[in-house]
């Protein structure tokens, strides 16, 4: 960066090299060049010469003033015009940054995804700070009082093996940067209460051509948790609103859920589960598409491919169509 150059003088910023965005700032340049009484001192921002708001303070020093500085980063350097020198002589340079102090971290959430071996903690960091902001996640045992701290710049994965102070903990997040420090409220957790079951996945769908055609959705999870509650939501792709069905589930076998749907319509399905009575849900599974047949039997091997016909089946339509979900954030 600009700060690594050899200097023939000194450049400094008031109030500081990192300051609150929107502040008025002054950049001072003091020349210390042998055999040079500078005729003029020049300031450059990101390589472009500044023309205005420059004040000569004395023979060797000048000040550049900025009102309401809004750039997150800038490289500043200053030069001197020395008598008998054809080119400007570099005095010194400095990288400057503007931004905001951190907001109080809120919505601190810690979950253990089954089989992951980690407790994952996330939070809402608030507004963008524009400057380097670090987060310290504090995990304190309610049983032993031992506290672990984890330094990160976003979320944190903490090995459950390192949580040796029993099952009950307090978790809080401290945010700090050059402009300030804030701290979240303390979240009380019990490790057994924050486990999210292994992901539920819809594997296929079939519509059985009976007097009233019915669609069966096949879905499963590798969870070892005994009591699991699930929700399946579905809608016609042309609709905005979801229909939701709730299930108390035992994953010792593949689940089959029955739906009576309109013919010749493309539907989308998603499923999510939680340990019964606990706080956190899985994110919704990836989107699963299934087109119900017209009254004529129809088989679909992929929801995105053309329809294929198979007239000798009681099964009117089979789908295995997935699309990765983009709304995976519903764990609260």
């Amino acid at each position: 960066g600009i700060t690594n150059i050899n200097c023939s003088g000194h450049i400094w910023v008031e109030p500081a090299t990192i300051f609150k965005m929107g502040m008025n700032i002054s950049i001072y340049c003091q020349a210390a060049i042998k055999n040079c009484q500078p005729r003029k001192l020049h300031f450059y921002k990101n390589g472009i010469k500044e023309r205005f708001q420059i004040t000569r303070i004395n023979k060797t020093t000048a000040r550049l003033w900025y009102k309401n500085f809004l750039e997150p980063h800038a490289s500043m350097y200053c030069t001197a015009e020395c008598p008998k020198h054809f080119q400007e002589t570099l005095i010194c340079g400095k990288d400057i940054s503007s931004g905001y102090p951190p907001d109080i971290p809120d919505e601190v959430t810690c979950v253990i995804y089954e089989y992951s071996g980690n407790m994952t903690c996330t939070w809402n960091a608030g507004k963008l700070t524009y400057i380097d902001t670090k987060y310290v996640v504090h995990v304190k045992s309610l049983e032993t009082e031992e506290e672990q701290q984890y330094l990160t710049s976003s979320y944190i994965n903490i090995s459950t093996d390192s949580l040796q102070g029993g099952k009950k903990y307090l978790v809080w997040v401290q945010a700090a940067n050059a402009l300030g420090m804030e701290e979240s409220k303390q979240l009380q957790i019990h490790l057994d209460d924050i486990v999210i079951p292994s992901a539920a996945v819809i594997s296929r769908a079939e519509t059985i051509n009976a007097t009233v055609p019915k669609t069966i959705i096949y879905w499963d999870s590798q969870t070892t948790i005994e009591k699991v509650s699930c929700e399946m939501r579905y809608k016609a792709t042309t609709n905005q609103t979801w229909n939701v069905k709730e299930f108390d589930t035992n994953f010792t076998y593949v689940q089959q859920s029955e739906f009576y749907l309109e013919p010749n319509i493309k539907y989308v399905f998603q499923v999510r589960c939680q340990e019964t009575g606990k706080r956190y849900w899985q994110p919704w599974s990836s989107l699963f598409f299934h087109k119900t047949p017209e009254t004529v039997p129809q088989v679909t091997s992929k929801a995105f491919q053309h329809d294929t016909w198979n007239s000798g089946l009681t099964v009117a339509s089979i789908s295995t169509g997935h699309l990765t979900s983009d709304n995976r954030g519903d764990i609260g």
Partner: antibody, heavy 121, light 112 residues
């Protein structure tokens, strides 16, 4: 058994700088631990000044009245914590204790013998 | 900022008396509270941690109770060596930038 040995008493003039130390033995310096400083002015109660957390990273915490007045640091390699002033005032005259449990709890099983700092012109 | 309010600030008692000192936190500190004894010219000594756990080597006449915001130190039968000043200390968290002091103001137990 953890032992904390503090540097000796100091007599200073206002405006002078000072760094006092607290050497720990028996602490597992590869584990996470808090080392804290407590002030006791003559005839007064205990006042928490701040702590340094030493673990995979180092973090310092200060009482709001001590922020900017003192600096807490530690040298893990020699198991020593420090409390320093850049410009002493007469009101800094007090007994200063370092304290720890040798772990990452905030109650103090172990205390140094105290360092008496006298600031007088 | 968590404030610790200790009462009484002083009390007079006789050997054999049951003595109770209270400490109130301005917000929930769970069971994160310690009690110390300090004698003149000496460093404080840990008596109780986690609100009710007796520190090593502390006589069983000392006991602590409470959680949340209200805590008590009890000396069941005061002994001559117990005349001293007692302090409570919140041990929840020190990372909050607004903390002024983590100790109570102290309770001086004097001979009646």
């Amino acid at each position: 058994e953890v032992q904390l040995v503090q540097s000796g008493a100091e007599v200073k003039k206002p405006g002078e700088s000072l760094k006092i130390s607290c050497k720990g033995s028996g602490i597992d310096f590869n584990s996470n631990y808090y080392m804290c400083w407590v002030r006791q002015m003559p005839g007064k109660g205990l006042e928490w000044m701040g702590c340094i957390y030493v673990g995979s990273h180092v973090n310092t915490y200060y009482a709001n009245w001590a922020k900017g007045q003192v600096t807490i640091s530690a040298d893990k390699s020699i198991s020593t914590a420090y409390l320093q002033w850049s410009s002493l005032k007469a009101s800094d005259t007090a007994m200063y204790y370092c304290a720890t449990s040798g772990s990452s709890v905030l109650y103090f099983k172990f205390w140094g013998q105290g360092t008496l700092v006298t600031v007088s012109s | 900022d968590i404030q610790m309010t200790q009462s009484p600030s002083s009390l007079s008692a006789s050997v054999g008396d049951r003595v109770t000192i209270t400490c109130q936190a301005s917000e929930n500190i769970y069971s994160f509270l310690a009690w110390y004894q300090q004698k003149p010219g000496k460093a404080p000594k840990l008596l109780i941690y986690s609100a009710s756990k007796l520190a090593a080597g502390v006589p069983s006449r000392f006991s602590g109770s409470g959680s949340g915001t209200d805590f008590t130190l009890t000396i069941s039968s005061l002994q001559p060596e117990d005349f001293a000043t007692y302090y409570c200390q919140q041990t929840n968290r020190y990372s909050n930038p607004d903390i002024y002091n983590v100790f109570g103001q102290g309770t001086k137990v004097e001979i009646k």
